[in-house]
């Protein structure tokens, strides 16, 4: 004979556990229904009545099956140096990512607390290591025979053109100038652009209790210029 299906709330077998999407209520000592994502427990179960769920209130969410008394508060609106890649809904928190040209300078347990602008290497310096979603650009001085005449977070040092007859010798921030005969290059011509990092890292603020209980709001710190380093500019 098939086992009888138990409807919540029910007392579990001694040493047994509750089924999927159920939880054991210590007060009622019963297996009770969890609430689905986007809802929370409005009334907890008793020995004779199951959990009563209700929709999350505006600007709050639950992402998992749960029995929390209040939904979690969505993070603050994204700051001006960020883009909202996921809106706050009843089932998910807002996700903000650093916009192109920025990186996450101060991480936290979930996401990013502070975006900062990618360092730009000034003339005479090129990109040694490109920026990523979580690390800044590293600049290096252009080695002899190479130059960079731009202020850029993507340009590397390029080789001087090789002249049959040099009019003006090149330096770290300027290409060589040849006399009218055609120059050649020691390597491939043209500026080499490193791709901008694509921010995909989740940066939602830490979930905090919904406003009706204790509304702890996470804030994004104000963005200052990136710390100066050799060969970089704050522009």
């Amino acid at each position: 004979l098939p086992a009888q299906v138990a409807f919540t709330p029910y007392a579990p077998e001694p040493g047994g556990t509750c089924r999927l999407r159920e939880y054991y209520d210590q007060t009622a000592q019963m297996c009770c229904s969890k609430c689905p994502p986007g809802q929370h427990a409005k009334v907890f179960c008793t020995k004779t009545s199951d959990t009563v769920c209700d929709s999350c209130e505006d600007s709050t969410y639950t992402q998992l099956w749960n029995w929390v008394p209040e939904c979690l508060s969505c993070g603050s609106r994204c700051s001006s140096d960020q883009v909202e890649t996921q809106a706050c809904t009843r089932e998910q928190n807002r996700i903000c990512t650093c916009r192109p040209g920025w990186y996450c300078a101060l991480s936290k347990q979930e996401g990013c607390r502070l975006c900062a602008q990618l360092r730009k290497c000034r003339p005479g310096f090129g990109v040694a290591r490109p920026g990523t979603e979580t690390s800044d650009v590293v600049c290096k001085p252009c080695a002899p025979g190479t130059f960079s005449n731009t202020t850029s977070s993507t340009d590397i040092c390029r080789p001087h053109q090789i002249c049959h007859v040099v009019a003006i010798p090149g330096n770290a921030s300027m290409d060589a100038v040849c006399t009218s005969t055609s120059p050649t290059r020691s390597m491939a011509p043209g500026a080499v652009h490193l791709p901008q990092p694509v921010s995909t890292r989740s940066q939602h603020t830490q979930p905090t209790p919904a406003p009706s209980t204790a509304p702890g709001t996470s804030f994004l710190l104000p963005v200052g210029p990136s710390p100066p380093a050799e060969g970089s500019t704050g522009d």
Partner: antibody
Framework: QVQLVQSGSELKKPGASVKVSCKAS????????MHWVRQAPGQGLEWMGR????????KHDPKFQDKAVLSSDTSVSTAYLQISSLKAEDTAVYYC?????????????WGQGTLVTVSS | DIQMTQSPSSLSASVGDRVTITCTAS???????LHWYQQKPGKAPKLLIY???NLPSGVPSRFSGSGSGTDFTLTISSLQPEDFATYYC?????????FGQGTKVEIK
């Protein structure tokens, strides 16, 4: 563009009812709340209640719980405010306003207002 | 209910003046849930500042907001002719959601 267009002015006698409409256009009605705010002549703003058009769930200021009925018809993107047992003190401009879910209740678009005058 | 008290109730100022309006809540309000509206005579209110300090697109940068807990401030750094209006703070922290009584900014 986003627009909330309300029905025209109403002149009603005490004890009567009135139904004000607010037609929304230019946005998806799904992830918003529609609020009703009233403003008596020369007075400030008073929040009456709000409706989630997607579910029909409503929330009122207890002061208006028995006075105002909020409803919506998503097929015509319209929210309604019905006020019953009108008294002279219900004379006011009634505004509808929307707040997107997740924007912490900021009412970013408002209707032009509907003047309801209650006089015998 | 959370009571929102604005001060002053009205003020007279000249074009170019710096104007500050305060809003005091009877109990703590999360910064995300505090907004300011501007209303001109015969017109619907307009969202001026959301979540204490954020400006919607199209709102001039002379408007700014600050505060936390129970005390919030709206500042107009240099009053312009089009800024003469009534300003309301609004809390959405706890239902019923409430407005301040308004501050009328008049021409001196």
């Amino acid at each position: 563009q986003v627009q909330l267009v309300q029905s025209g002015s109403e002149l009603k006698k005490p004890g009567a009812s009135v139904k004000v409409s607010c037609k929304a256009s230019g946005f998806n009605n799904k992830d918003i709340y529609m609020h009703w705010v009233r403003q008596a002549p020369g007075q400030g703003l008073e929040w009456m209640g709000r409706i989630d058009p997607a579910t029909g769930n409503t929330k009122h200021d207890p002061k208006f719980q028995d006075k105002a009925v909020l409803s919506s018809d998503t097929s015509v993107s319209t929210a309604y405010l019905q006020i019953s047992s009108l008294k002279a003190e219900d004379t006011a401009v009634y505004y509808c306003a929307r707040s997107p879910y997740g924007d912490f209740g900021a009412m970013d678009y408002w209707g032009q207002g509907t003047l309801v005058t209650v006089s015998s | 209910d959370i009571q929102m008290t604005q001060s002053p109730s009205s003020l007279s100022a000249s074009v170019g003046d710096r104007v500050t309006i305060t809003c005091t809540a009877s109990s703590s309000v999360s910064s995300n849930y505090l907004h300011w509206y501007q209303q001109k005579p015969g017109k619907a209110p307009k969202l001026l500042i959301y979540s204490t300090s954020n400006l919607p697109s199209g709102v001039p940068s002379r408007f700014s907001g600050s505060g936390s807990g129970t005390d919030f401030t709206l500042t107009i750094s240099s009053l312009q002719p089009e800024d003469f209006a009534t300003y309301y703070c609004h809390q959405y922290h706890r239902s019923p959601w409430t407005f301040g009584q308004g501050t009328k900014v008049e021409i001196k």
